[in-house]
């Protein structure tokens, strides 16, 4: 007979999860010559022991330390690129940008971005049926502690320039329950980090707002400023016009404003 | 960029001892697991071991497990092979090579020493 | 151990014609994810180099005229088109156990 398992709301676990986090792990081992001494049993081991065989609405940051100790890694001052709601305009900058990196850049956030993952308390198995979500379970599920136990260690590992995208089509251009908002932003270290500099993505082609006055932006300012760290804000009213400048600088068109 | 450099080949008489060494530079030494493997004259490779980051694990092949023993001094970014016990049949090319654990290939080898088993 | 038995022992090639070498592990040498099966290349008086590792993936800085192939005990290096650089001894690899074996080596040469 089949056992009884537990019905979450969310989706499951992506299928072939193990060998997805494997392949990813050694593929940017290959992209990533400087992390060849990672070893990608171990760290699919440590993933695995982070939620495997533990009730997945009970799951801690602490669960995810052997993971997050083999994956450390250290981004260069002034080379950290968070963001919020506007994850494949950022990712398209750090492909062209090389030198800058958001949290999907590094290892940890290259193995599990846009993956579900669960398992069931006392066996070890995964739950390919589904997993709990974040609203109608519990917030203290494997992929959001993951997220949030990583991002709170990417934002404390920055310094120099902190720069942030933002999403200026949205109601709320900074959201403080956004992970950048709750998270990010509160793990910031004001003895690394000399500034943050906002970059507000506009949507429409024909939208001259200075979004940087939008009433979330001044509150993130002064989060921001309370925590002795300067912030700077910047219009991006061409997206398409911003990545090409970032791909081509010579270009003509790229010496007047984006 | 990354280097290998073995040295402390040369002639040794059968029964003989010899400490061979390998020089790394370019990389973390000691992140990574480190390999000796050989070749004779004209023959193919021959895998001898590899050892881990902080030495606590060191896998030899099995017919030279109590004759060739391997250790390292990451502060010296030095890789070692202790040959005792010397036959004509261990006289080779030995080279070191780093090991991408997450693949188990062998990414980068050095240019290798030579040892020469002779009375 | 894992025997891995390559053959042919040699071969010679045309320039830009296809050059297939193949390797035979005693045993699986796969598991779900990967095939532990590397390709290196040694020119005459140097060390090998890595060409293709997991059985099919090419190292950086390898020409894409190198391919490999294969899963379970069977893989194939293949080289296409063959260039005249590309006169070596090609050895198979293991590492999906200890020991850690190699093939017995391929000599290509141009015809």
């Known amino acids: 007979l089949p056992r009884w398992r537990q019905q979450w709301s969310g989706s499951g676990t992506t299928s072939r999860f193990p060998e997805t986090v494997l392949a990813r792990c050694v593929k940017y081992t290959e992209v990533h010559p400087e992390m060849r001494h990672v070893d990608c049993q171990s760290v699919w081991d440590a993933f695995k022991g982070a939620f495997i065989s533990k009730y997945p609405c009970n799951i801690t940051e602490e669960d995810y330390q052997p993971l997050v100790k083999l994956g450390t890694q250290t981004v260069p001052c002034n080379k950290t690129l968070l963001w919020s709601r506007i994850k494949d305009l950022a990712h398209q900058f750090t492909q062209v940008q090389r030198d800058m990196f958001t949290l999907e850049d590094m290892l940890l956030g290259y193995l599990a971005d846009d993956l579900t993952w669960c398992g069931e308390f006392n066996t070890f198995e995964i739950n390919y049926q589904s997993c709990p979500d974040w609203r109608k379970d519990c917030s203290n599920n494997p992929v959001s502690v993951f997220w949030k136990t990583v991002s709170r260690r990417f934002a404390e590992t920055a310094c120099g320039v902190v720069h942030v995208m933002l999403n200026g089509s949205r109601s709320k251009i900074f959201d403080k329950n956004s992970t950048f908002g709750s998270v990010e932003v509160h793990n910031l270290q004001p003895e690394k980090v000399q500034a943050l500099e906002a970059w507000v993505i506009h949507g429409g082609r024909e939208d001259s707002r200075d979004l940087c006055q939008d009433p979330t932006i001044k509150e993130l300012e002064s989060i921001i400023s309370k925590r002795n760290i300067r912030f700077f804000c910047k219009n991006i009213y061409r997206p398409d016009k911003f990545l090409q400048c970032v791909k081509n600088p010579e270009d003509s068109s790229c010496l007047s404003g984006i | 960029q990354v280097q290998l450099l073995e040295s402390g080949g040369g002639l040794v008489q059968p029964g003989g001892s010899l400490k061979l060494s390998c020089v790394a530079s370019?990389?973390?030494?000691?992140?990574?697991?480190m390999n000796w493997v050989r070749q004779a004259p004209g023959k193919g490779l021959e895998w001898i071991g590899k050892i881990n980051p902080d030495s606590s694990t060191i896998n030899y092949t099995p017919s030279l497990k109590d004759k060739f023993f391997i250790s390292r001094d990451n502060a010296k970014n030095t890789l070692y092979l202790q040959m005792t016990k010397v036959r004509s049949e261990d006289t080779a090319l030995y080279y070191c090579?780093?090991?991408?654990?997450?693949?188990?290939?062998?990414?980068?080898w050095g240019q290798g020493t030579t040892l020469t088993v002779s009375s | 151990e894992i025997v891995m038995t390559q053959s042919p022992a040699s071969l010679s090639a045309s320039l830009g014609q296809r050059a297939t070498i193949s390797c035979r592990a005693s045993?699986?040498?796969?598991?779900?994810?990967?095939?532990?099966v590397h390709w290196y290349q040694q020119k005459s008086g140097q060390p090998p180099k890595l060409l293709i590792y997991?059985?099919?993936n090419l190292e950086s800085g390898v020409p894409a005229r190198f391919s490999g192939s294969g899963s379970g005990t069977d893989f194939t290096l293949t080289i296409h088109p063959v260039e005249s650089e590309d006169v070596a001894t090609y050895y198979c690899?293991?590492?999906?156990?200890?020991?850690?074996?190699f093939g017995s080596g391929t000599k290509l040469e141009i015809k």
């Open positions: 045993s699986s040498v796969s598991s779900s994810a990967f095939s532990y």
């Open positions: 997991l059985a099919s």
């Open positions: 370019g990389f973390d030494f000691s992140l990574y697991w």
């Open positions: 090579a780093r090991l991408w654990i997450a693949t188990g290939g062998f990414d980068y």
């Open positions: 690899h293991h590492s999906r156990e200890l020991p850690f074996t």
